[in-house]
Interface confidence: low
């Protein structure tokens, strides 16, 4: 039985050219996390594997940094980065938990929501 829940940074916004942290947290379960996948729509951005560590998709390596923790840092944001991001927790014995974050990248300093998740 899957008892866990995923908490995420929810809907967040950031300024073009800036950076932001995408963060998910799995709680209310004792299941072991074996791997976390970070995906943007249908693209795999990064994997954090319990045995192998982090692997960033080479096409994003210049703009994506692992962490903090199991989160993901997006840098040099562009308007094209706007969209849905998913953290997919593979756990044993529970199975798969998925969290959703919506990121909006804004042209100007209208990015007040989620500002606390931004990197100065």
């Amino acid at each position: 039985m899957m008892t866990g829940t995923i908490e995420t940074t929810g809907n967040i916004s950031a300024e073009k050219g800036g950076s932001i942290i995408l963060q998910c947290h799995l709680s209310s379960t004792t299941a072991q996390v074996t791997q976390v996948n970070w995906e943007q729509q249908d693209q795999l951005l990064a994997i954090c594997n319990a045995d192998l560590g982090w692997h960033i998709s080479p096409s994003f390596k210049d703009r994506v940094a692992p962490g903090p923790g199991l989160g993901l840092t997006l840098q040099s944001l562009t308007v094209n980065d706007t969209g849905e991001y998913f953290c997919i927790y593979h756990t044993y014995p529970d199975g798969t938990y998925t969290g959703r974050i919506f990121l909006e990248v804004l042209e100007s300093s209208v990015a007040e929501h989620g500002a606390r998740f931004q990197i100065p």
Epitope: Q35, I47, N49, L52
Partner: nanobody, 117 residues
């Protein structure tokens, strides 16, 4: 000593196919990923595709739908099936691998692929 040895390059006509192989030896552990990069004359080396030990694959936009990367973990060998080749695919293709997360740890010597009529 770790070695990556590429094979399968050659001359092919536009629209043709080639299959590159990369045999890795000397690893204490299986590489966490293996991949292919290429360098065309007078250009920077660019990433083409990579495959994780768990089977996940990534492709550069320029080769999506035409190239397929795969790996035989038991043999520590990666393959790049290249279909619908174009003259702009002409380059030296390099195999690369990584044992831990971070930078690419190992590189092959490269194999030349020429697409020309």
């Amino acid at each position: 000593e770790v070695q990556l040895v590429e094979s399968g390059g050659g001359l092919v006509q536009p629209g043709g196919s080639l299959r590159l192989s990369c045999a890795a030896s000397g690893f204490t552990f299986s590489p966490s990923w293996m991949g292919w990069f290429r360098q065309a004359p007078g250009k920077e080396r660019e990433w083409v595709a990579s495959v994780l030990r768990g089977g996940y694959t990534w492709y550069a936009d320029s080769v999506k739908g035409r190239f397929t990367i795969s790996a035989d973990n038991s043999k520590n060998t990666a393959y790049l099936q290249m279909n619908s080749l174009k003259p702009e695919d002409t380059a030296v293709y390099y195999c690369a691998s990584e044992v831990a997360s971070g930078e690419t740890d190992y590189w092959g010597q490269g194999t030349l692929v020429t697409v020309s009529s």
